[in-house]
Amino acid sequence: SGTTNTVAAYNLTWKSTNFKTILEWEPKPVNQVYTVQISTKSGDWKSKCFYTTDTECDLTDEIVKDVKQTYLARVFSYPAGNVESTGSAGEPLYENSPEFTPYLETNLGQPTIQSFEQVGTKVNVTVEDERTLVRRNNTFLSLRDVFGKDLIYTLYYWKSSSSGKKTAKTNTNEFLIDVDKGENYCFSVQAVIPSRTVNRKSTDSPVECMGQEKGEFREI
């Protein structure tokens, strides 16, 4: 049951990258407004985005409290200008979201190669440890802080003159690879959480090549 002239939200979808988490839904409101509630499976409902005409609600502040919990959200529909009005059953119309477990489901953001340094026939490639909105002791945690060894990086590297991509993997943020002397190489990295079955990989980082500013070359 619901309120006269209101329609229930539908297509409730979680959009989450590196724990920045937004709930989206349809339809665009016509003469109605929405309020979102979120809760863990065992917790109380908390209201967010009160009486909004938006069709999205940023729930990051709630989910970062415990990224390993499973969350459920619901979107209530109210007639515009009459938000106290309820349906015949005494409650507004609402729709439930799918369950969402941030640790297992947040998309991995595009990584960035912070630097690379060549010493002789070795190159050290460092991946930027991106900050998330997850907090511990009033400090924002990095992606590595949150995922620990569950997060790995795959490095793709290739001679500028060739197309075949070699790979290396690390469960830190650094790679040490062997290269041929006198050859220029290009690099791209991908974040991966191998223990997942879905949303396992990030998009690739921008390609960085030797001979550009980010790198440093030392002949030993």
Epitope: K169, N171, P194, K201
Partner: antibody
């Protein structure tokens, strides 16, 4: 259930071409990398190459470079091995295998293999 | 490319025997070594990954160890179904390479 099924093998003359398919089910290939490994009759395992379907990156073994090309169609959840300029020494059972891309990643699932015979 | 030198190429053993197969990497591969079992006409099956970790569903009589660039697969008590060919593989760097294989036959 995770499954890899190779097809497309057969008898081909030296210098000929063949395209092998590796159809995946139970997982999405773009979340993994797919490798091709071959085994000549009575011999050991030889790595042929890989593709990361999420970005199209590939690498081929020196023994097949310039003759074989690995590709993937994520909409069909299938990887391919295009083999040109085939030689007698390419005669083998060809396997595709899934790489979970962990630091310790071995090939956790393999197809049943498809036999390619290069002979006149 | 990294070479994986596997020995012996074949061995004969009886049910209940302890069997050891070794692989030596031509350079450091950290712990990025796997062991596979292959039976005639079948695809290889993963036994051990990361040098010493037992893959899901593999009997505990199989174990792996590492000492520097030397890697060992041990079958503590050979069973009838263990007669097969075993391969080591390094996946530390591209291209991944396999050992030549060890055929375990019935004595």
């Amino acid at each position: 259930e995770v499954q890899l099924v190779e097809s497309g093998g057969g008898l081909v003359q030296p210098g000929g071409s063949l395209r092998l398919s590796c159809a995946a089910s139970g997982f999405t290939i773009s979340d993994y990398t797919i490798h091709w490994v071959r085994q000549a009759p009575g011999k050991g395992l030889e790595w042929v190459g890989y593709i990361d379907p999420s970005n199209g990156y590939t690498y081929h073994a020196d023994s097949v470079k310039g003759r074989f090309t690995i590709s993937a169609d994520t909409s069909k959840n299938t990887a391919y091995l295009q083999m040109n300029s085939l030689r007698a020494e390419d005669t083998a059972v060809y396997y595709c295998a899934r790489d979970p891309q962990s630091v310790s990643s071995p090939f956790d699932y393999w197809g049943q293999g498809t036999l390619v015979t290069v002979s006149s | 490319d990294i070479q994986m030198t596997q020995s012996p190429s074949s061995l004969s053993a009886s049910v209940g025997d302890r069997v050891t197969i070794t692989c030596r990497a031509s350079q450091d591969v950290n712990t990025a070594v796997a062991w596979y079992q292959q039976k005639p006409g079948k695809a290889p099956k993963l036994l051990i990954y990361s040098a010493s970790f037992l893959y899901s569903g593999v009997p505990s009589r199989f174990s792996g160890s590492r000492s520097g660039t030397d890697f060992t697969l041990t079958i503590s008590s050979l069973q009838p179904e263990d007669f097969a060919t075993y391969y080591c593989q390094q996946h530390y760097t591209t291209p991944p390479t396999f050992g030549q294989g060890t055929k375990v036959e019935i004595k």
